[in-house]
């Protein structure tokens, strides 16, 4: 899509901070009086040349887009306004990292795209790590252990944070059925300085892509941009995505017919929102209005109880959340392949849980 | 003298929608910012978002995207705020304000409109 | 985004005092501040930029300081004319935020 808005956000940042240079005199407004240093022309024209070079990526999907030609037109004007030659420096975007205390440590500077390596070296010790996961009919394990069935439709937040977006989008199981499964998962991983250019990842059921929706499989040309990349296993029904510039790995499956999600994010990283940004699945749950219990079921097809708990127990011998949830979700949809999503689930909690005591969690209902 | 003269006072309904206008003489209006601060009131200021016409592009804060649309026509050298959606906690004095360096929101807002007063009440 | 919290909330001095007003930022912003005063009723007026930088016609008692979280404005000798209420904003990020506003009374 037209990405015209992603560049002018870009210039807009990389604008705020320049100061002094140039002919400044000149691009004071007539409002207060004169003031000296301020934005100087040769800053200025590092921005437009790099807005204009952004314009020119995107160019191709914004034909007929009103505000990416009155842009075009705008920073050809400034440039001409300001004697800016075509070919020269480019800003940089401006710096988003996770903040990060001590960086005038006296050691050389630790990689920026690395997290948890510079994480390490400024702390003195590995970030903190949480795991939320999102599967089945689809139950929420949230960071803090919650574990919650959810009744939602349509597209809900299980992340909204300074550097990632994801969104479940869910619809019922079968016609008439209370409980959901989610069919397709969007992610969006947010532009970073000297990491990755935005890129947006975006899975439906029987279409699992290993590459992000611009084709490519890492982070873009910046420097850092190996510091995010997709790979997979299994083409069709698992892909891995790891970002370690803010030290995320994220998985998900396909199984029956429903999409799963997993991941693992560091502490810093996963709670760097803001109050506006309170609706995630991931750090509350699911809202209590949107929760079910597991009283609440109305069962399809042949499959009893006994041979529901006997189908999940097979793969899942602690009766915890897990298993509960499995149980659940064969019930309702009628579908033994169900069994597959809590077992991956709970296996991916496996890999992900920094507290491995955490691991099985005990619904009270 | 760069000068920025508001629409007048609104009272609206619950649910509604307000467009403020902001309009600029006796300086250059198109590749200066504007940008929209509201105050509720015996509150603080909070930005909503901003445009720099000459780009036509609008930049909000997140807390009012999709709520918020800010426009300039600089045929008339004039910007416009629009909120939809209002509810009484939208009750506040709407201020459009002009950047104080071209092509920048950066160093402050030089140039300030009067304030136009906007009520939400059923 | 970025917080900005100043202190106090307000205040009350007799005029010819000095009067401090502290402003911080939840990240390092540098010197990218600005002071506004706001007389009741009135818009906003810039009075200082780039943390310590008087924006011209702006009387030379009111002075500001500080770099990366923590700022100072400060009235060298209060006037009556003074009376009004003092913001903090930062401008290294969008959206650029206010710090709650210092009211300042004579007493």
């Known amino acids: 899509q037209c990405k015209i808005l992603r560049c002018n956000a870009e210039y807009v940042s990389s604008t705020l901070s320049l100061r002094g240079g140039g002919s400044s005199g000149a691009l004071r407004g007539g409002g207060g009086g004169g003031r000296g240093g301020g934005v100087g022309s040769g800053g200025l024209c590092r921005a437009l040349r790099s807005y204009a070079l952004c314009t020119r990526r995107t160019a191709r999907t914004c034909r007929g887009d009103l505000a990416f030609h009155s842009a075009v037109h705008g920073i050809e004007d400034l440039m001409i306004q300001h004697n800016c030659s075509r070919q020269g420096p480019t800003a940089p975007p401006p710096p988003r990292g996770p903040a990060l205390p001590g960086a005038g440590s006296g050691l050389p500077a630790p990689d920026p795209c690395d997290y948890e390596g510079r994480f390490s070296r400024l702390h003195g010790r590995p970030p903190g790590f949480l795991h939320c996961a999102s599967f089945g009919d689809p139950h929420v394990r949230s960071f803090h252990h919650h574990f919650h069935t959810c009744r939602v439709q349509g597209a809900w937040p299980l992340l909204d944070n300074d550097f990632l977006f994801v969104q479940a989008t869910s619809s019922p199981m079968a016609l008439g059925a209370n409980a959901t499964a989610t069919r397709k998962l969007t992610i969006i991983f947010k532009n970073m300085q000297e990491c990755i250019d935005q890129k947006v990842y975006q899975a439906e059921v029987d279409n699992l892509p290993v590459a992000f929706e611009d084709g490519s499989i890492n982070g873009g040309d910046r420097p850092g941009g190996s510091s995010l990349s997709i790979q997979t296993a299994n083409p069709g029904n698992h892909v891995e995505i790891q970002a370690a510039y803010i030290g995320t790995t994220i998985i998900i499956r396909q199984t029956a017919g429903q999409l799963s999600f997993s991941i693992k994010v560091a502490e810093d990283v996963a709670m760097a929102f803001s109050a506006e940004q309170d609706l995630q699945l991931c750090v509350g749950g699911c809202p209590p209005s949107q929760r079910l219990s597991r009283s609440e079921r109305n069962r399809r097809g042949a499959i009893t109880i006994d041979t529901a708990r006997r189908l999940c127990k097979e793969g899942l011998p602690v009766e915890d959340a897990y298993f509960h949830s499995c149980v659940f979700d064969v019930l309702i949809s009628g579908d033994p392949n169900f069994t597959v999503a809590a077992q991956a689930a709970l296996e991916d909690a496996r890999a992900f849980l920094p507290d491995l005591e955490k691991l099985h969690l005990f619904p009270s209902d | 003298q760069v000068q920025l003269v508001q629409s007048g006072a609104e009272v609206k309904k619950p649910g509604s929608s307000v467009k403020v206008s902001c309009k600029a003489s006796?300086?250059?209006?198109?590749?200066?910012?504007i940008s929209w601060v509201r105050q509720a009131p015996g509150q603080g200021l909070e930005w909503m978002g901003g445009?720099?016409?000459?780009?036509?592009?609008?930049n909000y804060a997140q807390k009012f995207q999709g709520r918020v649309t800010i426009t300039a026509d600089e045929s008339t050298s004039t910007a416009y705020m629009e909120l939809s959606s209002l509810r009484s906690e939208d009750t506040a004095v709407y201020y459009c304000a002009r950047g104080a360096y071209e092509a920048t929101y950066g160093l402050g807002m030089d140039v300030w409109g009067q304030g136009t007063t906007v009520t939400v009440s059923s | 985004d970025i917080q900005m919290t100043q202190s106090p909330s307000s205040l009350s001095a007799s005029v010819g005092d000095r009067v401090t007003i502290t402003c911080q930022a939840s990240?390092?912003?540098?010197?990218?501040l600005n002071w506004y005063q706001q007389k009741p009723g009135k818009a906003p007026k810039l009075l200082i930029y780039?943390?310590?930088n008087l924006e011209t016609g702006v009387p030379s008692r009111f002075s500001g300081s500080g770099s990366g979280t923590d700022f100072t404005f400060t009235i060298s000798s209060l006037q009556p004319e003074d009376i009004a209420t003092y913001y903090c904003?930062?401008?290294?990020?969008?959206?650029?935020?206010f710090g709650g506003g210092t009211k300042v009374e004579i007493k």
């Open positions: 006796g300086g250059t209006f198109r590749s200066y910012s």
């Open positions: 445009i720099i016409p000459i780009f036509g592009v609008a």
């Open positions: 904003q930062q401008l290294v990020d969008l959206p650029p935020t």
């Open positions: 990240q390092d912003i540098s010197n990218y």
């Open positions: 780039d943390a310590s």
